[in-house]
Interface confidence: low
């Protein structure tokens, strides 16, 4: 399957549901459809409270049954491993594909973990992470943040992806904002004596 690179914030904002969950076993093929489903155990919901309503959780994640049509294949055998799943809601069910943002929770940087819980939501609907995959590329709007990891790092997993979110600076402007404590080391409080 060929997926467009996605910044974690884009994945968060464009998903109906973002949850932490564990995969409980092998997929089950659903007769008469081209889907299969994985049984999952949801541990935390990070986005989708409004869409879900009173539902206590999702027992299954549905995906196309064929890899050639971008079906997700879960490789880990570790049932205790927790995953971040950014998926879509279809007919009340959680749907994922090979292009879904779906990674072990512990693989996310601490900054990303914090952002999925709290920060990314502030940029949704207001700011857009705009991928720059070839030079030259330019900002098309003040609400865009230019994502250059693919060019500078040769990968979608780069500094902007790991440590930054595109957030409103004022009502008309979005900028990259650092997800950590500070970009610079704190200066020594006392000067050395001459």
């Amino acid at each position: 399957c060929s997926c467009a690179p996605t910044h974690p914030q884009t994945a968060f904002c464009n998903s109906d549901l973002v949850i932490r969950a564990k995969f409980m076993g092998s997929p089950e093929i659903i007769e008469t459809t081209l889907y299969q489903r994985y049984e999952i155990k949801m541990t935390k919901m990070l986005k989708g409270f409004d869409a879900v309503g009173n539902a206590t959780g999702f027992r299954f994640a549905y995906t196309p049954a064929m890899e050639s049509l971008c079906g997700y294949v879960h490789k880990s055998q570790n049932r205790s491993e927790e995953f971040l799943i950014a998926g879509r809601l279809r007919n009340g069910n959680l749907h994922i594909t090979a292009c879904s943002f779906l990674v072990p929770w512990h693989n996310l940087s601490p900054a990303q973990q914090k952002a999925f819980v709290k920060t990314y939501s502030a940029g949704c609907g207001v700011c857009t992470v705009f991928p720059c995959s070839a030079i030259p590329c330019k900002l098309e709007s003040d609400s865009h943040c230019l994502w250059t990891d693919q060019i500078l790092m040769g990968s979608e997993k780069g500094y902007q992806s790991d440590h930054f979110a595109c957030l409103p600076r004022n009502p008309d402007l979005c900028t990259w904002q650092y997800l950590g404590v500070s970009m610079t080391r704190s200066l020594p409080l006392a000067k050395a004596e001459a």
Partner: antibody, heavy 121, light 109 residues
Amino acid sequence: QVQLVQSGAEVKKPGESLKISCKGSGYSFTSYWIGWVRQMPGKGLEWMGIIYPGDSDTRYSPSFQGQVTISADKSISTAYLQWSSLKASDTAMYYCARLVGGGYDLMFDSWGQGTLVTVSS
Amino acid sequence: DIALTQPASVSGSPGQSITISCTGTSSDVGGYNYVSWYQQHPGKAPKLMIYDVSNRPSGVSNRFSGSKSGNTASLTISGLQAEDEADYYCQSYDDMQFVFGGGTKLTVL
């Protein structure tokens, strides 16, 4: 070379049934999806559904689910599109197309010549 | 199904370059590198011109090129020729659904 040959034009009355065909040759018919696409007079292309002749797995567009049936007979390398009860709004050109779908490629690379279906009382 | 958005018509003179846009969502055009472009002359079947955003099938002129930025894909035809006059359709993919654009009529002046 890859060829998809469709059955000839049809003129039908509302309420009648119809089955049109698409015969593939020049490639392994059971190894590729076949899609059906509708084009109403003067309008654009609309994807209706796909079938994998190897095992007859079928997927429909929500717009066409329950309106048509897609099937295939792999022994004669032929895919079918059928209606149980035609409506005037089914008047259109219908194309079959081979879907290359695997790995990093996904496209309808070869098309049939089209079957014109006219439904009129 | 929501069709991808294309301009209804574009035009250009012989030798010029034109670009046709195709706007979708983060789920289809933006989510996968699966955008195809088809050319259709009146009374003929569609013909594949570009696949996987920017790849040309063998036999298609290198005057045709494709690209994508965000949720918008583009087809560019350089050195416009009379035989390029036709309808052009983009097509993308989203979770086992295939969606076409509304089509763009290209007129060579």
